[in-house]
Interface confidence: low
């Protein structure tokens, strides 16, 4: 911690400006008023302070706001955000999406840090649910964000937010997560016509039950093998050879290349050899 020392004559800061970069750490501590710093936080980012100097500025804000910073300060933290610990952030009450965006921007291009994870958690809990705008923002910065949530957390995602989800946002989701998201997607896209519906629902099908796959097989959707391989095994097993043929359309030939991988291999074991032979692919049950 920086020692308390008197500010040298004539060095008392009247505003936050570039002259402060020449101040030693103890001078910053002694000569910069915390309240002045709080009201002029937006200027800090334009000044090339060293990490050590930023530590002093953070210390001043911590003293001024021991219960946590107000949102007016948080919104303008900029690179000072990188100095915050998860414990600091847990004291905050962030309600503005603009504040969230400003802080995510600081961390852009890096993996989600514990600080960012804590910030997002505080923000989402404060809102009560993951609304569309928030989800839009979070997946734009972190495409894997949705799949980092537990099934319990995903249950708070309203169906309307599903419109913000892009296929790449679901790349790392496991079956339990898709089990939660699929019914929401089905509800969100229910009023779309057949081909448009399939384009939207395709990424969520890893959570689809057998009856929905059967229904899709009647709609000439031509599901690709990559999507088929992500389906729940227990949902695929009851499908007949004819249903899988209709579901995959021209992609059915791809079953041969995947015959040793589940869910294809388990599905094959369930079929009568006579039925498999109708595909003409040489699949052996």
């Amino acid at each position: 911690e920086v020692e308390k020392t008197a500010c040298p004559s004539g060095k008392k800061a009247r505003e936050i400006d570039e002259s402060l970069i020449f101040y030693k750490k103890w001078e910053l501590e002694a000569c910069v008023d915390a309240a002045l710093l709080a009201t002029q936080m937006d200027r800090v980012n334009a000044i090339p302070f060293t990490y050590e100097q930023l530590d002093v500025l953070k210390h001043k804000l911590d003293e001024l706001y021991p219960q946590g910073y107000p949102e007016s300060v948080i919104q303008h933290l900029g690179y000072l955000f990188l100095k915050m610990s998860p414990e600091d952030i847990r004291k905050w009450n962030v309600t503005s999406l603009e504040t969230l965006k400003a802080l995510l921007e600081v961390n852009k291009g890096h993996e989600m840090s514990p600080q960012v994870a804590t910030l997002i958690d505080r923000f989402v809990k404060g809102r009560g649910q993951l609304d569309k705008d928030t989800l839009d923002t979070l997946t734009a910065f972190y495409p894997g964000y949705l799949c980092s949530l537990s099934p319990e957390e995903l249950s708070s995602v309203p169906p309307s937010s599903i419109w913000a989800v892009r296929p790449q946002d679901l790349d790392t989701c496991d079956p339990r997560q898709l089990d939660v998201l699929y019914p929401k997607a089905r509800l969100a896209f229910q009023n779309m016509n057949g081909s448009e519906y399939f384009v939207k629902i395709q990424s969520f099908l890893g959570g689809a039950p057998t009856e929905d796959l059967k229904a899709l097989s009647q709609q000439n959707v031509s599901m690709d093998l990559a999507t088929f391989m992500k389906l729940r095994t227990d949902a695929v097993l009851p499908l007949t050879v004819a249903e899988v043929q209709k579901l995959l359309g021209p992609h059915v030939e791809g079953l041969k290349a995947e015959e040793r991988h589940r869910p294809v291999r388990d599905w094959i074991l369930r079929q009568r050899q006579d039925d498999l032979d109708t595909l003409g692919l040489g699949l052996q049950g």
Partner: antibody
């Protein structure tokens, strides 16, 4: 949380059938998301996968053991079982039951049971 | 069957060392590779699945990388509790083969 527990005789005579049962607690063997496997490890050696069963009864066995292995499931008792016929001393090993997720990883294991084949 | 070859079969290291174990598949297995840790008298424990995904509850000093035929398990800073045998395993084809294991011992 899900736990697995192997049970069965620790000593089997050559040419007889080895029988083991794995009891699943804290979860259901009928879950559509998991496969239930048997894996063994001879003393001082590496791991060898024996086979798996799905709650529906679908099975898949290691090709090198296929002719001697039967794995079955009893959903009412929340158990799955292994039978290995015509055993020899080479089948002496610690036998583990394990749960496999859809990604092919064994994420939960029983503590293992040592089975010795000897007359 | 796909063969999995681990190297080295054993290694000696000190606490704090960075340790790297490699696993090679006899044919491409995409990213279908898992890593396990086993201590004497205990069941194996899943560390990494799908080549690079850290299993829940596993310390972040463990990491996995690779795809195709060559894979690596790295322990960034070896801890006393990390002395154990490590196995790779492929779930790509129906034989689910494991590597022969790498024993990490105290130097």
């Amino acid at each position: 949380q899900v736990q697995l527990q192997e049970s069965g005789p620790g000593l089997v005579k050559p040419s007889e059938t080895l029988s083991l049962t794995c009891t699943v607690s804290g979860g259901s063997v009928s879950s559509g998301s998991y496969y239930w496997s048997w894996i063994r490890q001879p003393p001082g050696k590496g791991l060898e996968w024996i086979g798996y069963i799905y709650y529906s009864g679908s099975t898949n066995y290691n090709p090198s053991l296929k002719s001697r292995v039967t794995i079955s499931v009893d959903t009412s008792k929340n158990q799955f079982s292994l039978k290995l016929s015509s055993v020899t001393a080479a089948d002496t090993a610690v036998y583990y039951c394990a749960r496999e997720g859809k990604n092919g990883a064994f994420d939960i294991w029983g503590q293992g049971t040592m089975v010795t084949v000897s007359s | 069957d796909i063969q999995m070859t681990q190297s080295p079969s054993s290694l000696s290291a000190s606490v704090g060392d960075r340790v790297t174990i490699t696993c090679r598949a006899s044919q491409s297995i995409s990213s279908y590779l898992n890593w396990y840790q086993q201590k004497p008298g205990k069941a194996p424990k899943l560390l990494i699945y799908a080549a690079s995904s850290l299993q829940s509850g596993v310390p972040s000093r463990f990491s996995g990388s690779g795809s195709g035929t060559d894979f690596t398990l790295t322990i960034s800073s070896l801890q006393p509790e990390d002395f154990a045998t490590y196995y790779c395993q492929q779930p790509y084809d129906a034989s689910y083969t494991f590597g022969g294991g790498t024993k990490v011992e105290i130097k």
